[in-house]
């Protein structure tokens, strides 16, 4: 640690004295202190010297020396007060920054350490400190304003009593800087424009920060706008708003447009596009496909995505039938706006009942006209089966009918003994009918098919059964020949009630 | 060995506000006083402020409307701003350690800022 | 206008002595020291001489410096091509509480 001489830890001198410091250490030494006047810096091998041969109030604070190449960082002081009896302070600061919360030190030096006890700070012009001002007061650093905060940034002076009367010092300007977390925080309303040429628009930029010190700047297709700036401070924020007017759009003002702040801390950027059209236009599109396949019972929602401008003026759900008149409920019809010019329709149809198979049309009117689309609903249902027995051409025929969609497939088993249904072990024959003929198939209805299996004999211990399946499931009917004539068994879990 | 480097925008736009901010290497900014130098090719080198860790300022009167000066400890930094520029703020700023004799021992390597629209 | 007032050029040849003047004012040179600062091309200053005569390590004896009244003076003795540069006085201003410069003067080694 280098040593001063003299080696002790204050110097009261008079004005015009002689003053040298010395520092001794044991590599190269620096003296640091607040820049002076009338002070001499020389070197002398290992050690420094300070001196004036006319000291000055000026020259009161503390000297500290330092050995630069002292890892420990090792350093001793002084502090040299010089007793000028018209002159109570010595003042190290025209103005002192601080940011909100911490210490402000106003560098008021007392000259004369037997002043301490009649010290005090004031605002200019000797108006009292603000309500809960929480200060300190150091002789050798002066007056320490404790957690400053913004509403303190202030011009002080420093009282000191001399002989019964207040003495002030030269003013010190507090500034307390607010705290930037970051870059400003930035608006631009709105998120995306359209509109038609010829038509008015209006784009606002704005940002916003705790401190006055940021830009912003709107700027279109990378060119900066020259708007006039509005500015405001409300809740503790200072705005800044940059707004476009335009009375007639035309093409040349679409584009993307960008909002940008920024101070100290950064830069904040936001953008939109602008669209301008040449009329109205309304689009429908959906993701799902248009031709919908639910099985019976289970739910559906429909969604239509709408792209429009100017907004809707009207919009419905419509069932165009094949089976009642009944309208979609509204409580069903659900709607959604992603942004300003898109919004997602929505019907939700949940436990589906063969009456509400066919055609789901969504109608939406704007000033560019109506639009629709239209979505068609067709339900599955697992195959029906019966089983007659009947004479067609002279030859005994069973009959099979299956209703079901999709279409179902119809295969006979000939199996052994009486039973409901046929199962591997006792199955004899087995006929697939690949190609049944169709009774009925019309539009969101269920396909009906049949299929005819000669029999030149009936075998009496002996069981014909039917059986069709599609995508959904599969059902069968036994037919039991008795010698009383015929006997048709359809299996209790195939019944269908829908 | 104490090193300084300025940093900051080259261009400012006049009546815009020129800030700098100066990066400490090497030993703390919590000791000695720190200080703005600028060199115009019009007036020469031009002192325009101290500052002292705690954030104790003194400005070059001709300057001291709109200048501040300000610390961040926390990052061994201090920084400079300018209102209100002109032309005749185009010049190399430097930022340097100060002597308590008011002389500069570490000078940063200077950053030119013009101002021009 | 510099408040302190240095030729704008000198020049000299090598291994001669150059001196170079520097005046100011009671307020700055009559009542401080005077520091010298040497700036090669295309660098920042660097400090030469502090409290009138003193040389910070790593200079050379072939600069010093001296201070009369209000005028202060840097000689260069031994003149080298690297001595080519632009030199500034500079003293503390009591009417000003801070530094100020001379407007330089281009040294030119010929």
């Known amino acids: 640690i280098p040593v001063i001489e003299p080696s002790v830890p204050e110097l009261v001198v008079k004005p015009g004295a002689t003053v040298t410091l010395r520092c001794v250490g044991n590599g190269s030494v620096e003296w640091d202190g607040p820049p002076s006047p009338h002070w001499t810096l020389y070197s002398d091998g290992s050690s420094s010297i300070l001196s004036t041969n006319n000291a000055t109030f000026q020259n009161t604070g503390t000297y500290r020396c330092t050995e630069p190449g002292d890892p420990l960082g090792g350093s001793a002081a002084i502090h040299l007060y010089v007793k000028d009896p018209a002159r109570p302070w010595n003042v190290l600061a025209q103005e002192v920054v601080v940011f909100e919360d911490q210490d402000a030190l106003l560098p008021c030096l007392l000259t004369d350490p037997v002043l301490e006890a009649g010290v005090s700070l004031v605002r200019v012009r000797g108006r009292p400190l603000m309500r809960h001002t929480n200060y300190s007061f150091s002789p050798w650093h002066g007056f320490t304003i404790h957690r400053a905060k913004f509403i303190q940034s202030q011009d002080y002076q420093c009282s000191a009593l001399m002989g019964g009367r207040k003495v002030m010092s030269i003013s010190i300007r507090l500034k307390v800087q607010k705290v930037i977390p970051g870059p400003p925080a930035l608006t631009l309303v709105p998120a995306e424009l359209v509109r038609i040429r010829g038509e008015a628009a209006q784009i606002v930029c704005s940002a916003s920060s705790v401190d006055v010190n940021f830009d912003v700047f709107l700027q279109h297709n990378n060119t900066k706008l020259a708007i006039p700036q509005q500015s405001d401070f409300h809740n503790n924020r200072y705005q800044k708003v940059l707004t476009l007017n335009l009375d007639q759009v035309d093409f040349q003002h679409a584009g993307n447009y960008s909002c940008v702040a920024s101070n100290v801390q950064g830069k904040h950027s936001t953008s939109m596009f602008f669209r301008v059209v040449e009329s109205a236009y309304l689009n429908l599109s959906s993701e799902q496909n248009l031709i919908q396949e639910v099985t019976v019972g289970e739910g559906l929602n429909l969604k239509v995505m709408v792209e429009a401008y100017p907004g809707l003026q009207g919009f419905n759900w419509t069932y165009l039938g094949p089976f009642s008149d009944h309208q979609p409920e509204p409580k069903l019809a659900n709607a959604t706006t992603k942004d300003t010019y898109r919004h997602t329709f929505t019907l939700s149809l949940p436990r589906l009942k063969p009456s509400e198979a066919g055609r789901y049309s969504f109608l939406a009117r704007n000033p560019g006209g109506w639009r629709a689309l239209t979505f068609e609903l067709t339900l599955r249902y697992p195959p029906e089966v019966s089983v007659i027995w009947t004479f067609i051409n002279g030859s005994g025929t069973l009959l099979c009918a299956a209703s079901g969609y999709p279409q179902p497939n119809v295969t006979w088993l000939q199996c052994s003994g009486h039973t409901d249904r046929c199962d591997e072990a006792q199955v004899l024959q087995v006929w697939d009918d690949p190609y049944p003929e169709v009774l009925s198939q019309e539009p969101f209805h269920k396909v009906t098919v049949q299929s005819l299996l000669t029999v030149e004999t009936l075998e009496h211990n002996q069981t014909y059964e039917c059986r069709a399946h599609n995508s959904v499931g599969s059902g069968s009917w036994a037919f039991i020949p008795i010698s009383a004539g015929a006997h048709t068994h359809p299996p209790d879990e195939f019944l269908f009630t829908p | 060995q104490v090193q300084l480097q300025e940093s900051g925008p080259g261009l400012v736009k006049p009546s815009e506000t020129l800030s700098l901010t100066c990066t400490v290497s090497g030993g703390s900014i919590s000791s000695y006083y720190w200080s703005w130098i600028r060199q115009s090719p019009g007036k020469g080198l031009e002192w325009i402020g101290y500052i002292y860790y705690s954030g104790s300022t003194n400005y070059n009167p001709s300057l001291k409307s709109r200048v501040t000066i300000s610390v961040d400890t926390s990052k061994n930094q201090f920084s400079l701003k300018l209102s209100s520029v002109t032309a005749a703020d185009t010049a190399v700023y430097y930022c340097?350690?100060?002597?308590?004799?008011?002389?500069?021992?570490?000078w940063g390597q200077g950053t030119l800022v013009t101002v021009s629209s | 206008q510099s408040v302190l007032t240095q030729p704008p050029s000198a020049s000299g040849t090598p291994g001669q002595r150059v001196t170079i003047s520097c005046s100011g004012s009671?307020?700055?040179?009559?009542?401080?020291?005077v520091n010298w600062y040497q700036q090669l091309p295309g660098t920042a200053p660097k400090l030469l001489i502090y409290?009138?005569?003193q040389r910070p390590s790593g200079v050379p004896d072939r600069f010093s410096g001296s201070k009369s009244g209000t005028s202060a003076s840097l000689a260069i003795s031994g003149l080298q091509s690297e001595d080519e540069a632009d030199y500034y006085c500079a003293a503390w201003d009591d009417s000003l509480n801070g530094p100020v410069f001379g407007g330089g003067t281009k040294l030119t080694v010929l």
């Open positions: 009671s307020s700055n040179i009559g009542s401080n020291t």
């Open positions: 340097a350690r100060a002597l308590l004799t008011g002389g500069f021992a570490y």
């Open positions: 409290s009138n005569n």
